[in-house]
């Protein structure tokens, strides 16, 4: 369908750089969630960082164009980067509105899929867009 | 500010391929903005043709979908249109425009062209 | 697509009217009650210039005698008090669904 797609928005303090420029953002009658209503894609993402005892979100939006993965109905995370050791960025991407408000799951740290501690290593900041 | 300038032939023969080119100034076509051409008929109508993203992804309106491509020479900070097999409906000024969102908020003055053999 | 239909097609009035134009949509406009019209002004030889986004978003630098409003299929543009200036043509625009669809135009002249 001709729609546009509109994804949940979030970014982080602290994150450097910004994917609000890929969509236009909603008066959705809340403070939060925000939601943005993509311009050059189908397409949402979400980007988490798993330690041991929790996930974060880091960020949430809309995709700079489609992309495999972009025709997932649920936002399944895979691992993509080490932003320190014991943690981990997962990302998401995923083709219905909002699906990226929330993941199905994650897998443990550690567990099999999960780069190993000696992976790639990267300032917070520059490691989000490592995993994007 | 961001200013945009069409240039091009102004007339093209029947079957033949239209090309046009903006060229952008006071704005990087790669750091932000869809990058869209609209073309306005001698009856008045305007039509929406189609953009080249920032990052250079394209979107075309489903009606010219085969016979339109617009491309960019980031280089030159330039983007351009192409249009196959023209007829005379195909007459009509052609206006290149910015938008930083789904609204046309930057245009050029607009290049009449003129199909005729 | 999604169909514009402006009314009226032309108008005559003066300056210091009061003007109202319509512009109907083959279907709804809204995203999550977010309305996706626009309107703009053109004037002979010249390119469209942005005058309300987002139905009711009056663009900088645009005067305050011009507002927006409406919702869902029905939107409409008025000028408060009509300027020299003014003698125009409107038109609407949606980017609710691709293609970006635009309005047949309505002429203002002078009485």
């Known amino acids: 369908p001709p729609n546009r797609r509109t994804c949940v928005f979030f970014e982080a303090p602290g994150v450097r750089g910004s994917t609000k420029t890929l969509g236009e953002l909603l008066d959705t009658g809340t403070e939060l969630p925000r939601a943005i209503r993509c311009l050059y894609s189908r397409c949402c993402f979400g980007i988490w960082n798993l330690t041991q005892d929790r996930a974060q979100v880091e960020m949430q939006g809309c995709r700079d164009s489609d992309e495999p993965g972009c025709e997932s109905l649920h936002c399944d995370p895979s691992p993509r980067a080490h932003p320190s050791p014991g943690s981990t960025l997962f990302t998401c991407s995923c083709g219905t509105d909002f699906c990226n408000a929330n993941y199905s799951h994650l897998p443990p740290p550690g567990s099999p899929g999960t780069p190993g501690s000696q992976g790639p290593q990267a300032a917070p900041g520059e490691s989000i867009w490592m995993a994007l | 500010q961001v200013q945009l300038q069409e240039s091009g032939p102004g007339l093209v023969k029947p079957s033949e391929t239209l090309s046009l080119t903006c060229t952008v100034s006071?704005?990087?076509?790669?750091?932000?903005?869809?990058w869209n051409w609209i073309r306005q008929f001698p009856g008045k109508g305007l039509e929406w043709m189609g953009y080249?993203?920032?990052?250079?992804?394209?979107s075309y309106n489903p009606s010219l979908k085969s016979r339109i491509t617009i491309s960019r020479d980031t280089s030159k900070n330039q983007f351009s249109l192409k249009l196959s097999s023209v007829t005379a409906a195909d007459t009509a000024v052609y206006y290149c425009?910015?938008?930083?969102?789904?609204?046309?908020?930057?245009w050029g003055q607009g290049t009449l062209v003129t199909v005729s053999s | 697509d999604i169909q514009m239909t402006q009314s009226p097609s032309s108008l005559s009035a003066s300056v210091g009217d009061r003007v109202t134009i319509t512009c109907r949509a083959s279907?709804?406009?809204?995203?999550?009650?977010?309305?996706?019209m626009h309107w703009y002004q053109q004037k002979p030889g010249k390119a469209p210039k942005l005058l309300i986004y987002?139905?009711?978003n009056l663009e900088s630098g645009v005067p305050s005698r011009f507002s927006g409003s409406g919702s869902g299929t029905d939107f409409t543009l008025t000028i408060s008090s009509l300027q020299p200036e003014d003698f125009a043509t409107y038109y609407c625009?949606?980017?609710?669904?691709?293609?970006?669809?635009f309005g047949g135009g309505t002429k203002v002249e002078i009485k």
């Open positions: 279907e709804s406009v809204d995203t999550y009650g977010n309305s996706f």
């Open positions: 425009a910015g938008s930083r969102y789904s609204w046309f908020a930057y």
């Open positions: 080249i993203s920032f990052s250079g992804s394209t």
């Open positions: 625009q949606q980017s609710n669904e691709d293609p970006y669809t």
């Open positions: 006071g704005y990087s076509i790669t750091s932000d903005f869809a």
């Open positions: 987002r139905a009711s």
